[in-house]
């Protein structure tokens, strides 16, 4: 699996999407887990509804929510109020029994809030025609890691 990078802005929401073959993973619950080190386990953060038929219902664990479009084959994870400590490697998983198949490997990168400047001259204020919500769009800039890029750089 290649790793897909999703970038979000600190304090805002980040939406991660994981496409999959809906027939191949028919009837399977899904999960979002955080990779603990290169060879470490993937620690479950949140999983879809216990009843697969209700997978479309949003389930939440803290600031992380998950929902599954089982017909379209897209698992969506939303990280609210993104913080620097949310940065790291994650996996979208398809569950069967005690098995967990990786649907997508994800690297979440947290960018500094461009509005969070001490210099008031740099502060951007929404115009009259723009709502406050418009200023907090859900950022989801994604790319795949380039060949040769190391997902887990060796630590000294």
């Amino acid at each position: 699996h290649n790793t897909t990078v999703f970038q979000g802005v600190e304090g805002q929401s980040l939406q991660v999407s994981c496409p999959y073959d809906s027939m191949k993973h028919w009837g399977r619950r899904k999960a979002w887990c955080r990779q603990l080190g290169e060879k470490g386990p993937c620690q479950r953060v949140v999983s879809t509804h216990n009843l697969w038929l209700l997978s479309f219902l949003r389930r939440r664990n803290g600031s992380t929510a998950i929902t599954d479009d089982t017909l379209g084959g897209t698992l969506t994870i939303t990280l609210r109020n993104l913080q620097p400590h949310d940065a790291g490697f994650y996996q979208c998983q398809s569950l069967h029994g005690s098995e967990a198949d990786t649907l997508r490997k994800v690297l979440v990168e947290v960018l500094a809030d461009p509005l969070d400047h001490r210099d008031a001259g740099d502060l951007w204020v929404p115009g009259e025609s723009e709502s406050f919500e418009d200023a907090h769009v859900e950022h989801s800039i994604s790319r795949s890691l380039l060949e040769g890029e190391i997902p887990f750089p060796p630590t000294s």
Partner: antibody, heavy 123, light 107 residues
């Protein structure tokens, strides 16, 4: 009607190669996992491995990893089991089976089976 | 690998008898278990899935129970066509191993 039709019996010599087939009909072959199961003479069932023809995702039992190759051609709804160098101990009946899919749950159970292919390896 | 152990390996019974076959998994598999019937020269036939659900078309005299590591297949009243070999199979993880089989013979 769902059917899995396997290729006919084979008699081979040790060291020869072989590829047997399992053709599906009456269902969307691409969307079902297909397993291979071995039954040696007078013995029980042994799960060898499984393939999803849609993307050729394949899983092997550690006992058979490196001993056989499982493949599929979704364009002709056919799964294959092959050996590059047969041994006398490969003499067995080989079954293909479709993994059942429930409307509400995932599954690892096999609801439709081929009739079996007898492979005899003898010098 | 999860190993499946069936007992007994063979059992003799008469038409009308109640017969129970057990299957034990080497580790917990929740209810991810199937039972198959196989007659000589034929392919196996799915009887029970999810430990206790009866496959469509299977007679009601067949029933399954259990969860975790211990499972049973019960035939409430043996019929002549039930004499065959029975296998359990775990579906919790790969490889999806079968038990070694239980041969049900006429007494």
């Amino acid at each position: 009607e769902v059917q899995l039709v396997q290729s006919g019996a084979e008699v081979k010599k040790p060291g020869e190669s072989l590829k047997i087939s399992c053709k599906g009909s009456g269902h969307s072959f691409t969307n079902y996992w297909i397993a291979w199961v071995r039954q040696m003479p007078g013995k029980g069932l042994e799960w060898m491995g499984i393939i999803y023809p849609g993307d050729s995702d394949t899983r092997y039992s550690p006992s058979f990893q490196g001993q056989v190759t499982i493949s599929a051609d979704k364009s002709i709804s056919t799964a294959y089991l092959q050996w590059s160098s047969l041994k006398a101990s490969d003499t067995a009946v080989y079954f293909c089976a479709r993994q059942r899919t429930f409307y509400y749950d995932s599954s690892g159970y096999f609801d439709y089976w081929g009739q079996g292919t007898l492979v005899t390896v003898s010098s | 690998d999860i190993q499946m152990t069936q007992s007994p390996s063979s059992v003799s019974a008469s038409v009308g008898d109640r017969v129970t076959i057990t299957c034990r998994a080497s580790q917990g598999i929740s209810n991810w278990l199937a039972w198959y019937q196989q007659k000589p020269g034929k392919a196996p036939k799915l009887l029970i899935y999810a430990a206790s659900s009866l496959q469509v078309g299977v007679p009601l005299r067949f029933s399954g129970s259990g969860s975790g590591t211990d499972f049973t297949l019960t035939i409430s009243s043996l019929q002549p066509e039930d004499f065959a070999t029975y296998y359990c199979q775990q579906a919790d993880s790969f490889p999806r191993n079968f038990g070694q089989g239980t041969k049900l013979e006429i007494k």
